[in-house]
């Protein structure tokens, strides 16, 4: 099985023990590590952070001691914006220039492939996204002709039904991608006005339309029905939680909220907590399991957080094995307890290790 793990370059900027550099990563933990994100400037793939090149080197030296490890560079992301991707993909010349710039850039910096993180193609971009993938793959095949190992091509796709329908021609893009990471998280957010888990495995008993689509099981099944081969589908598992501020004394699933949860000490983003911050939060919190959805949430005071723990990730791995998927994807290594100092287990990357162990279990 594949264990595809994202590393985010901006994690270097977190304060104190939250700061994560690629040299903190475990070279034997994942089969693939994806560095997020690269930029595109003047239609050429480019660095984003000022020190990206140094971090690329730091990441890729992990392969010195584990030659089986593959590293990919993810281009795009939330800050890049869909419009910029749209401009490049829809213009034949821009698209060609971008595609041509990728192999030398990846080779120069020691990457084994490219991950496309166009978040997200609009309805009018659907065909352009397919063309971009098809032409990128063709370029990778051509570039590898002189006996080089062919560069890998993957894409991170939304797990939301509405986005899947408008953005992707699943059957066509699947032909050209080496694997597809489906982002089976962020199904529920503060915009809903109530508490809810952002990455449930199954549909909740109370879920009505459109909530019945907002779960991992539906998204995976839908992708498979649309023609994604199970052998190429990698299922996303988050090492972060989504938090809310409760608006009343109600604390269950569906309780009213006044907004996102308070920012974490290190990640500093309202409504989001890294797993290592959740481990801190759990001290003195009340933990519940949403039985049907097979995921936990915790409450403390007026704070509510839905997250994944070692038990829930094992359930998710068992599920992906039952569906004969290609493996699991983790967003992100730097949100797991990468130092092993927060979650009281004397173990670095406890969630990712639990996923790895479950994938290896017979």
């Amino acid at each position: 099985y594949k264990l595809v793990c994202y590393y985010t370059s901006w994690s270097q900027y977190r304060e104190g023990d939250g700061s994560c550099f690629p040299d903190a990563l475990d070279r034997f933990l994942c089969t693939h590590i994806i560095y997020s994100f690269a930029n595109i400037s003047n239609d050429h793939i480019d660095t984003w952070e000022w020190n990206d090149v140094t971090l690329y080197g730091m990441l890729n030296t992990l392969k010195n001691r584990n030659p089986n490890l593959k590293t990919l560079l993810s281009v795009g992301g939330w800050n890049f914006g869909s419009q910029r991707f749209s401009k490049i993909a829809s213009n034949t010349q821009s698209r060609r220039t971008f595609i041509k710039s990728v192999p030398p850039f990846l080779r120069t910096h020691g990457f084994d492939g490219l991950d496309l993180a166009w978040l997200y193609p609009g309805r009018r971009d659907k065909q352009h996204f397919t063309t971009l993938i098809k032409e990128m793959k063709a370029e990778f095949i051509k570039e590898a002709q002189p006996g080089k190992k062919q560069l890998l091509l993957s894409a991170a796709l939304s797990a939301g039904k509405v986005t899947i329908d408008s953005s992707y021609d699943i059957a066509k893009i699947s032909q050209h991608l080496d694997f597809i990471s489906i982002m089976t998280y962020d199904f529920h957010g503060a915009w809903r006005g109530t508490t809810g888990h952002h990455s449930p495995l199954f549909r909740g008993q109370e879920d009505a339309s459109p909530d019945r689509f907002s779960n991992t099981d539906y998204a995976v099944g839908y992708m498979l029905r649309l023609g994604a081969p199970a052998s190429k589908l990698v299922m996303g598992i988050p090492t972060f939680g989504r938090s809310f501020t409760l608006a009343s004394s109600e604390t269950g699933v569906g309780a009213p909220i006044s907004g996102p949860g308070i920012p974490g000490r290190f990640t500093k983003e309202a409504g989001t907590l890294a797993y290592y911050e959740i481990c801190d939060f759990l001290r003195g919190a009340t933990v519940h399991r949403i039985l049907g959805q097979q995921v936990p949430y915790a409450t403390k005071g007026n704070q509510w957080v839905g997250y994944d723990d070692q038990e829930s990730v094992k359930s998710k791995v068992q599920y992906l094995k039952d569906r004969q998927l290609a493996g699991a994807m983790v967003w992100a290594l730097d949100l797991d307890d990468f130092q092993g100092s927060f979650c009281g287990q004397d173990l670095r990357f406890p969630l990712t290790n639990a996923i790895k162990d479950a994938l290896a279990a017979t």
Epitope: Y13, N42, H44, T47, N51, V53
Partner: antibody
């Protein structure tokens, strides 16, 4: 061996111009952001300017904004600093530095003296 | 702009002493604090980046700590070659700024 070598310094009158160069070798110059840092005689270090690897992003200290221009020629592995409208307070040793996780490689510096 | 204030501006110490230099930022700079050593007539040399990470080839007697606005460079046992001027620098946001320097002299 990774190396940066500055040149172009010298004596110039107030209001005059000078162009500094920094020749890079031993690393893939086009992949790294570069900086200029200066040090007035007997004083501390002052960051002057920065340019991204592609040249698409440029930053200046307020003290030189509008007078100095940073540029690079990746085909020649060279960084430049065009200094116009020079003032006495611009007198300093000018260093170029490579951006790694911070300024991990520095040149030996070139002295610029602004005096009448 | 972010101001960096180093203290002391100079200190006298003997070989074998433990030396501590502090650097304070005018606003939070997360972990984005670097330390450089400079000897007379020479270019600065990177010692520590990102608050506590030792640059390759730098002796382990040098260490850094801190977070947010307050940072420390420690030399656990001062050696003859350590007599120099030390600068902190923030690379959290432009314009990058340096502290005014701390000169470590022989007592």
């Amino acid at each position: 061996e990774v190396q940066l070598v500055e040149s172009g310094g010298g004596l110039v009158q107030p209001g005059g111009s000078l162009r500094l160069s920094c020749a890079a070798s031993g690393f893939t110059f086009s992949s790294y952001a570069m900086h200029w840092v200066r040090q007035a005689p007997g004083k501390g270090l002052e960051w002057v300017s920065a340019i991204s690897s592609s040249g698409g992003s440029i930053y200046y200290a307020d003290s030189v904004k509008g007078r100095f221009t940073i540029s690079r020629d990746n085909s020649k592995n060279t960084l430049y600093l065009q200094m116009n409208s020079l003032r006495a307070e611009d007198t300093a040793v000018y260093y170029c530095a490579k951006q790694g996780l911070s300024f991990d490689i520095w040149g030996q510096g070139t002295l610029v003296t602004v005096s009448s | 702009d972010i101001q960096m204030t180093q203290s002391p501006s100079s200190l006298s110490a003997s070989v074998g002493d433990r030396v501590t230099i502090t650097c304070r930022a005018s606003q939070s700079i997360s972990n984005w604090l670097n330390w450089y050593q400079q000897k007379p007539g020479k270019a600065p040399k990177l010692l520590i980046y990102a608050t506590s990470r030792l640059q390759s080839g730098v002796p382990s007697r040098f260490s850094g700590s801190g977070s947010g606005t307050d940072f420390t460079l420690t030399i656990s046992s001062l050696q003859p070659e350590d007599f120099a001027t030390y600068y902190c620098q923030q690379s959290y946001s432009f314009p990058y700024t340096f502290g005014q320097g701390t000169k470590v002299e022989i007592k």
